[in-house]
């Protein structure tokens, strides 16, 4: 019986450790600046790193610019988006800007896309300053189902700061769905 | 056998509860305004409270102005930094400000420092207003190894809001490394 | 003995799963725009959805405009607040605005209210622009006791963006108190 108990304890530690790790998908994706779309209207950002520098992914999938949920659960989602402009880049088309981020969820089963979180600011980036910068941070707790996709849209993508510490988004699973 | 099973259940509840608590380091550090460093360029903030008001720490260490990781894991890191100026403090030497925060990770083994997250904004704090305020929030999910250190750098530290609800940073462990 | 072990494993899986879910209260509350207070001074927002769209709650209670903690623990709290104005809404009373959010904790046992987190910005929303927008995000890790209440105060509530992706706050339990 003692041996049996030891076996129970041992297998349980393994099982608990294994199931804990399996139960916690996460992703932290950083902007891939080699492929940022242009324009000033709202566009979906599809190029993100998932395996270099701070970028990482586990038990989730990154495909076609979207973060795909592989496991039902409640997740904390976040995004940090930095915009910047230096006068050496030339004049802005307009000095009045709407710098925005939208974190959206797409359900494949019922083809539909919904914004989970948005943030940003209208800015007056006058040509009188040599440098302009602005960052947005959003975060929230959402129920996600396997197969659902998370994507990030921004306005004025040509103004994005391409550093990995500046423009990124991510998710981590906090708990199962009852 | 029944008694044995009860013993297994009992010890497991204890073990599970104990290991769960041990496995979850956290810290929430609030600015210590009696010792804010000086300078207008980027400076490291080294004075933080860890045990008064909202400030707290568990299974992490605060030393020499840095938050030291004691346990490998994936952590959610965050910072909230507020800047403010009132005309009673005198005119600003420049009305054009770059108000920034940088959350950095230093590895002692390989002496190097890297920025994990940055945020902020350029601001025009005109003398036409008696009061100015601006807050930055950043957050992200990062793999941290025991011995690594997290620190916070800001521009214009003399403009920091010294309230514990205004200027703080923190971390909590979400999961183990596989 | 084998049967006994299987029984231990089975009951443990149930127990682990059940206790894990019970141990993780959460809430994500979205603004109820049908009942936003007016004025430009700091007011408490009392109308929030808890069961429609992205809004949800579990093992916490929403009552009288406050999020009530039912279970001691360390929680990650967050808020995202969006302000906006379009010229079609008429002129602003003042172009100089202080757009702020305060996340507060009220203890019933010792009747007192304390601000846990604050954020925002002073803004100059000139009549030269037809549209203005600004978002604030705050987040932090706090020890909460059963019976304590979390509420959100903002300045200029009449400028709040009523979308569920824009103005929300929430909490999720990360760990027990030792």
């Amino acid at each position: 019986i003692r041996a049996e108990k030891a076996m129970v304890d041992g297998s349980w530690l393994d099982l608990a450790k294994r199931s804990k790790l399996e139960a916690q998908p996460f992703a932290h994706l950083t902007i891939n600046a080699t492929n940022i779309p242009t324009g000033s209207h709202k566009v979906s950002l599809s190029s993100w790193y998932h395996d270099r520098g701070w970028a990482k992914i586990s038990n989730m999938t990154f495909s076609n610019g979207k973060l795909i949920v592989n496991q039902d659960g409640f997740y904390y989602l976040y995004a940090n988006i930095c915009f910047r402009h230096h006068e050496t880049s030339g004049d802005l088309a307009t000095e009045y800007l709407q710098l925005m981020v939208y974190v959206t969820k797409t359900s494949i089963k019922i083809p539909s896309s919904h914004t989970l979180m948005k943030g940003g600011s209208t800015k007056y980036w006058s040509g009188n300053s040599e440098f302009h910068f602005y960052s947005i941070n959003v975060g929230g707790f959402f129920k996600l189902r396997s197969g659902e996709e998370i994507s990030v849209e921004v306005s004025n993508p040509s103004l994005l700061d391409p550093d990995q510490d500046a423009t990124y988004f991510g998710a981590f699973k906090v708990r199962d769905i009852d | 056998i029944r008694a044995e099973k009860a013993m297994v259940d009992g010890s497991w509840l204890d073990l599970a509860k104990r290991s769960k608590l041990e496995a979850q380091p956290f810290a929430h550090l609030t600015i210590n305004a009696t010792n804010i460093p000086t300078g207008s360029h980027k400076v490291s903030l080294s004075s933080w409270y860890h045990d008064r008001g909202w400030a707290k720490i568990s299974n992490m260490t605060f030393s020499n102005g840095k938050l030291i990781v004691n346990q490998d894991g994936f952590y959610y890191l965050y910072a909230n930094i507020c800047f403010r100026h009132h005309e009673t403090s005198g005119d600003l030497a420049t009305e054009y400000l770059q108000l920034m925060v940088y959350v950095t990770k230093t590895s002692i083994k390989i002496p190097s420092s890297h920025t994990l997250m940055k945020g902020g904004s350029t601001k025009y704090w005109s003398g036409n207003s008696e009061f100015h305020f601006y807050s930055i929030n950043v957050g992200g999910f990062f793999k941290l190894r025991s011995g690594e250190e997290i620190s916070v750098e800001v521009s214009n530290p003399s403009l920091l809001d010294p309230d514990q609800d205004a200027t703080y940073f923190g971390a909590f462990k979400v999961r183990d490394i596989d | 003995i084998r049967a006994e072990k299987a029984m231990v494993d089975g009951s443990w899986l149930d127990l682990a799963k059940r206790s894990k879910l019970e141990a993780q209260p959460f809430a994500h509350l979205t603004i109820n725009a049908t009942n936003i207070p007016t004025g430009s001074h700091k007011v408490s927002l009392s109308s929030w959805y808890h069961d429609r769209g992205w809004a949800k709650i579990s093992n916490m209670t929403f009552s009288n405009g406050k999020l009530i903690v039912n279970q001691d623990g360390f929680y990650y709290l967050y808020a995202n607040i969006c302000f906006r104005h379009h010229e079609t809404s008429g002129d602003l009373a003042t172009e100089y605005l202080q757009l702020m959010v305060y996340v507060t904790k009220t203890s019933i046992k010792i009747p007192s209210s304390h601000t846990l987190m604050k954020g925002g910005s002073t803004k100059y929303w000139s009549g030269n622009s037809e549209f203005h927008f600004y978002s604030i995000n705050v987040g932090g890790f706090f020890k909460l006791r059963s019976g304590e209440e979390i509420s959100v105060e903002v300045s200029n509530p009449s400028l709040l963006d009523p979308d569920q992706d824009a103005t929300y706050f929430g909490a999720f339990k990360v760990r027990d108190i030792d």
């Epitope: 440098f131 | 000086t38 300078g39 207008s40 360029h41 005119d91 420049t94 054009y96 770059q98 | -």
Partner: antibody, heavy 119, light 107 residues
């Protein structure tokens, strides 16, 4: 190349006014502050004030309020210092200098203009 | 207004000497301090900004330090072209104020 070129020496009578110029090149004047600094004979440097050419906003040391008026013409990239009701006390070298918006140091200076107030 | 005091109005040193020039403020200025060099011909140049940052093109023999109310400029090894007057300037608050200057001469 960044340059601040100041107008030539002036000899003026007490009670008169004078307008000194500082013509800039090699940078966008609207992205800077232009400052004026006085140096009396055998004395140190004294800040008079500054202008933000982008919007015309000015700040002065109270000692020079009413005495000095700083203006700028962005079309010609030129800043001006007008001094009124001159006395012998205003005899000095006047420097213009620039600082970038986000940094409060004078990284480039003009060569100085000598003003002599004498009857 | 914040008063800036350079107690030493003139200083004699030999080539190769290590020279330190001090400057004190009437109140704490949070490291908001710059150093300038004025040559005998009147030209003025920025040397050090924000207490210790070397301006581009300035030789590395120049360095700055200090905190609170007390600041200093150091020339590690005096060169002939360093003969000039040195001014500190605070930018903690308006009005911007300079020290009276320290004239560096050759022994």
């Amino acid at each position: 190349e960044v340059q601040l070129q100041q107008s030539g020496a002036e000899l003026v009578k007490p009670g008169a006014s004078v307008k000194l110029s500082c013509t800039t090149s090699g940078f966008n004047i609207k992205a800077t502050y232009i400052h004026w600094v006085q140096q009396r004979p055998e004395q140190g440097l004294e800040w008079i004030g500054r202008i933000d050419p982008a919007n015309g906003n000015t700040k002065y040391d109270s000692k020079f309020q009413g005495k000095a008026t700083i203006t700028a013409d962005t079309s010609s990239n030129t800043a001006y210092l007008q001094l009124s009701s001159l006395t012998s006390e205003d005899t000095a070298v006047y420097f213009c200098a620039r600082s970038l918006h986000y940094y409060v140091f004078f990284d480039y200076w003009g060569q100085g203009t000598t003003l002599t107030v004498s009857s | 207004d914040i008063q800036m005091t350079q107690t030493t109005s003139s200083l004699s040193a030999s080539l190769g000497d290590r020279v330190t020039i001090s400057c004190s403020a009437s109140q704490g200025i949070s490291n908001y301090l710059n150093w300038y060099q004025q040559k005998p011909d009147g030209t003025v140049k920025l040397l050090i900004y924000s207490t210790s940052s070397l301006h581009s093109g300035v030789p590395s023999r120049f360095s700055g330090s200090g905190s609170g109310t007390d600041y200093s400029l150091t020339i590690s090894s005096l060169e002939p072209e360093d003969i000039a007057t040195y001014y500190c300037q605070q930018y903690s608050k308006l009005p911007l104020t300079f020290g009276a200057g320290t004239k560096l001469e050759l022994k």
